[in-house]
Interface confidence: low
């Protein structure tokens, strides 16, 4: 028996359902009683879901997995993973045994988009050209870790005094805080771009300082 899976990682958004595709080619006269199907975590070999002795043995993984029972006889051994979490990310092995056996691994990449950045300025009043200011760009609840870029009003990169921290919350999603310390010109726009490298999602925030008032 030959097992086939997608070579590309399956990308799933947090809180949505994902399908890990796996298929085999059943011989004529194939019966589900002949099938032993096991999904397991590739690295730890932890059992995720199984179908043996002609019946679905159910989820061994947080009760969030399911097979496609009506499609098994056609050779569809795909696994549905519900309400995807950050901790579900990784490699899953589909193991099929009929008379002989084969297995293949499929990768699950979890992602969550970042929120539109909020911008804060310190100090935020009585600003003059030449003052040193701290601009903070905050974006929330994304995954995986973001790439953060700062640019000036001409779109040129600001790479100088930048400190970026990323903290994971209890769900494994990241909150990003990036701080730019800059000496004010006569006026200027400072833009922060938070990029999710998996989703190719860019979230933009900017602050324009033109004396008073500031615009965000």
């Amino acid at each position: 028996v030959e097992v086939q899976v997608s070579e590309d990682p399956v990308v799933a958004l947090v809180d949505t359902d994902a399908t890990l595709r796996c298929s085999f080619s059943p011989e004529p006269g194939f019966s589900l009683r002949q099938l032993n199907l096991i999904w397991q975590l590739t690295d730890t070999k932890q059992l995720v879901h199984s179908f043996t002795e002609g019946r679905d043995q159910g989820s061994a993984y947080a009760n969030r997995t399911a097979l496609f029972p009506d499609l098994l006889v056609q050779g569809n051994a795909s696994l549905r993973l519900q309400r995807v979490r950050v901790t579900d990310e990784g490699s899953y092995t589909c193991f099929v045994s009929i008379q002989d056996f084969d297995s293949a691994a499929v990768s699950l990449q979890v992602a969550a988009p970042y929120s539109k950045p909020s911008m804060t300025l310190e100090p935020n009043k009585d600003l003059r050209p030449g003052d040193m200011v701290t601009i903070t760009c905050s974006s929330y609840q994304g995954y995986p870790e973001a790439e953060v870029f700062w640019k000036d009003g001409q779109g040129l990169p600001l790479t100088g005094n930048v400190t970026t921290s990323q903290m994971a919350n209890e769900r494994g999603l990241f909150d990003v805080h990036s701080v730019l310390r800059v000496v004010l010109g006569a006026n200027g726009t400072y833009s922060c771009l938070v990029r999710n490298p998996v989703l190719q999602q860019d979230a933009h925030g900017s602050v324009t300082i033109t004396g008073q008032p500031m615009t965000f």
Epitope: S6, D8, V10, V11, A12, L13, D15, T16, D17, A18, T19, Q82, R83, A111, A112, P113, S115, Q141, N196, V198, L199, Q200, Q201, D202
Partner: antibody, heavy 118, light 107 residues
């Protein structure tokens, strides 16, 4: 059986407002992103916006940003598209669709026609 | 924004023909590209997702592939029910864009 049913379309004057609804059934609404996609008469598909039903994540096409607002009510299994400052070029059939995996929408509603005309 | 340029805009073919439709992305994109079939007065139907994965219940005569920024939908042997309009769609940077569509007509 998964179903999405749009409602709320109709004839509205330029500058007017309309709220579309997308009633979902047959799946766990709170775990799926929902999209709105539109199709002008005789034209192609144009993506409008998406939302996670928690309301935490939303995203809009540039053409509707600032005029349209997408929202969801998980207690009613319904997504909404509030359309303000409507223009003639917003005339289209509006579909809601369920997000399947990144880059795809697997179930679509039947669509509701919005006509913006004086 | 990333543009998806779809070609041809229309084609005539006969039952049993092999049909190929291409979408070219204006810049580098991930494999998050989907293909849909739409018939007049109906909602689109998902055929292919992640560039090459066949959606559940879709006949195996449909396939998708990728080469760089070019994405291709192939119908290996056109059937009467396949005469329709086909759209590609990408989702880079959370902004979704569709190709202009390809109408497949009976020769």
């Amino acid at each position: 059986e998964v179903q999405l049913v749009e409602s709320g379309g109709g004839l509205v004057q330029p500058g007017g407002s309309l709220r579309l609804s997308c009633a979902a059934s047959g799946f766990t609404f709170s775990t799926y992103y929902i999209h709105w996609v539109r199709q002008a008469p005789g034209k192609g598909l144009e993506w409008v916006a998406w939302i996670h039903p928690s309301g935490k994540y939303t995203y809009y096409a540039d053409s509707v940003k600032g005029r349209f607002t997408i929202s969801a009510d998980t207690s009613k299994n319904t997504a909404y598209l509030q359309m303000n400052s409507l223009r003639a070029e917003d005339t289209a059939v509006y579909y809601c669709a369920r997000h399947y995996q990144v880059g795809a929408m697997d179930y679509w509603g039947q669509g509701t026609l919005v006509t913006v005309s004086s | 924004d990333i543009q998806m340029t779809q070609s041809p805009s229309s084609l005539s073919a006969s039952v049993g023909d092999r049909v190929t439709i291409t979408c070219r992305a204006s810049q580098s994109v991930s494999s998050a590209v989907a293909w849909y079939q739409q018939k007049p007065g109906k909602a689109p139907k998902l055929l292919i997702y992640s560039a090459s994965s066949l959606y559940s219940g879709v006949p195996s005569r449909f396939s998708g592939s990728r080469s760089g920024t070019d994405f291709t939908l192939t119908i290996s042997s056109l059937q009467p029910e396949d005469f329709a309009t086909y759209y590609c769609q990408q989702s880079g940077r959370s902004l979704y864009t569709f190709g202009q569509g390809t109408k497949v007509e009976i020769k």
